[in-house]
């Protein structure tokens, strides 16, 4: 019986990411006896909940239960029944709910209350639903990618487990783009910070990390588009908005009430002599880029260096993983390759945006028109945000790695959140045992 393997004791965890545009459920698993090792937790399933984000259910809270049902039942199928009661379930809501809370704390609480009641009906160990802060979202995203890249591991390897992993232990910065907010998180060269609000200190696996993070609320791709439309309609002479961020020949009617529904457009709100306006695409990257830049206030900076809107940003340092919508958009546009320079990306965006809408619809027949129509804006916005907002350059562009998954696990804040809440990231380096006691008998 010397080499007979015993069945491994596997643990599971569930995290629901209640984003502004949709909710996703992630199931993670790991060997119980290796809880404190780095890199042992991996994602076994992602279930995307059909429908919009939970903040949209504010007037229909009694439908939240059925909205979550399919993905929660999927979790029941994937996780062995014997493990259900000890499987923790966490729900973290991000910027969509932060915006709802700004409008009405009572309504946000009501949505979360119904979410909690719905999730408590399942046989798992429900640990609560809460709105996470922008700082947490940035920090947990940073922890996730560095955990998956093996950056916290003290063991040096002669081989690479993932494409971006060099043998050094320098952490990657994290760039996260959602629908309603965007986060930048990295370890700057200079340990002292001019802005304590943006400083985080971690001790992970025996090493100290001084991390810079900031979350820009209203600068996710969807809210940025609402901001841009609200800004541009101010100067429109009539109810036609000729928009360079949409393909030539594209037309869409927008309700002014929808435009001003979000707190993100409040600064541009004005009384308009019409209830609706029509977007007419003209497909011009350069003009779109100029329009997007007007969303970033770079005229005021109370620090040595700022990103935009007076927010401190230290000099960029090292490699960055760009995930979530950074990846989804750039992947759709076929621009995620390490070999594509920033100049080439800009050139491809110019070409893409200028393509007629009818041509685009034919080329991407399987893609929902609502999403398809916004890739020109989203791609332009990503370039503007990275280059003018965060001050990446043509040279430092090659340090940005557009990442969807790392070793089968999605890049994003959810894994880091679970690792933290289940105490699976020790402050000190665990003592390594030569052989796990339960592996061989």
């Amino acid at each position: 019986t010397q080499n007979k393997a015993l069945p491994e004791n596997i643990k599971y965890g569930i995290v629901l990411d209640a984003g502004s545009s949709h909710t996703s459920l992630y199931i993670y698993k790991w060997p119980a006896e290796k809880e404190n090792d780095t890199g042992v937790v991996h994602q076994v399933e992602e279930c995307r909940v059909k429908g919009p984000g939970i903040s949209k259910y504010v007037q229909k809270v009694n439908e939240i239960g059925i909205y979550l049902t399919d993905c929660m039942e999927r979790a029941r199928e994937v996780i062995p029944r014997s493990q259900h009661q000890e499987t923790p379930v966490y729900l973290g809501a991000t910027a969509g709910m932060r915006l709802l809370r700004m409008e009405s704390e009572e309504l946000a609480d009501r949505v979360l209350d119904v979410v909690e009641r719905s999730l408590s009906n399942y046989p798992f160990d429900f640990q609560g639903a809460r709105i996470i802060t922008g700082q947490e979202e940035g920090a947990y995203g940073w922890i996730t990618i560095n955990y998956l890249l093996g950056k916290f591991s003290q063991k040096t390897r002669w081989f690479s487990i993932v494409p971006y992993e060099t043998n050094n232990q320098e952490t990657f910065g994290a760039l996260d783009l959602g629908g309603a907010s965007t986060q930048i998180t990295f370890v700057p060269q200079n340990q002292t910070t001019e802005s304590p609000d943006n400083a985080l200190q971690f001790r992970l696996y025996g090493k100290d990390y001084n991390v810079y993070t900031h979350s820009f609320l209203c600068y996710g791709k969807d809210q940025a588009l609402w901001q841009k439309l609200a800004k541009d309609i101010q100067v429109a002479s009539n109810e036609i908005l000729r928009d360079p961020c949409f393909h030539p020949g594209y037309k869409k009617v927008v309700n002014v009430s929808d435009l001003y529904k979000t707190p993100c457009t409040k600064r541009f709100e004005m009384t308009l002599p019409f209830q609706q306006f029509e977007i007419q695409g003209i497909g011009n990257y350069q003009q779109c880029h100029q329009s997007v830049l007007e969303l970033f206030n770079t005229s005021y900076c109370p620090y040595s260096q700022c990103a935009f809107n007076g927010i401190f940003l230290p000099p960029l340092q090292g490699d960055f993983g760009a995930f979530s919508a950074f990846y989804f958009v750039m992947n759709f546009l076929n621009l995620t390759s390490e070999k594509v320079s920033q100049e080439k990306v800009t050139e491809m965006m110019k070409k893409f945006c200028s393509q007629p809408w009818e041509e685009i619809k034919t080329s991407y027949a399987g893609v929902k028109e609502k999403y398809l129509s916004e890739y020109c804006f989203s791609g332009t916005y990503i370039l503007s945000l990275l280059l003018q907002g965060y001050h990446f350059t043509a040279d430092s562009w090659e340090h940005i790695h557009f990442i969807g998954k790392i070793q089968g696990s999605d890049a994003g804040w959810t894994l880091g959140y679970m690792l933290n809440l289940t105490n699976m990231i020790p402050a000190e380096q665990p003592l390594s045992t030569p052989l796990s006691h339960s592996t061989y008998v």
Epitope: G51, K56, T69, D70, D222, K368
Partner: nanobody, 124 residues
Framework: EVQLLESGGGLVQPGRSLRLSCAAS????????MGWYRQAPGNERELVAA???????NYADSVKGRFTISRDNSKNTVYLQMNSLKPEDTAVYYC??????????????????WGQGTQVTVSS
């Protein structure tokens, strides 16, 4: 378009059972969710039970353990089995078929179809 036709309502004594049926016809491929709402005089319409395309169900707290929703895809019909009926279950019951929009603008539902309603009265 989707048409929904309810049947099975009526007058019943407390503690007894009723089964409501809702037959769907038309472009039913656009539908992922089906459910039963009810509206008592002077009250808002409330969701009683719902079922997804995968057959997963959800119930209002007030009917849990008493009502069962089911779906027969071959007949394009959804049922509501109502046991241990109480006077407070008295209402007009509406069949609803819908799907959610994935977008953050406009209405929550992309498709939303309703039946005419069937009266359920629980009284001794």
């Amino acid at each position: 378009e989707v048409q929904l036709l309810e049947s099975g309502g009526g007058l019943v004594q407390p503690g007894r059972s009723l089964r409501l049926s809702c037959a769907a016809s038309g472009d039913i491929f656009s539908i992922n969710y089906m459910g039963w709402y009810r509206q008592a005089p002077g009250n808002e319409r409330e969701l009683v039970a719902a079922i997804t395309g995968r057959g997963n169900t959800n119930y209002a707290d007030s009917v849990k353990g008493r009502f069962t929703i089911s779906r027969d895809n071959s007949k394009n019909t959804v049922y509501l089995q109502m046991n241990s009926l109480k006077p407070e279950d008295t209402a007009v019951y509406y069949c609803n078929a819908w799907d959610y929009s994935d977008y953050d603008e406009g209405p929550l539902r992309e498709y939303d179809y309703w039946g005419q309603g069937t009266q359920v009265t629980v009284s001794s």
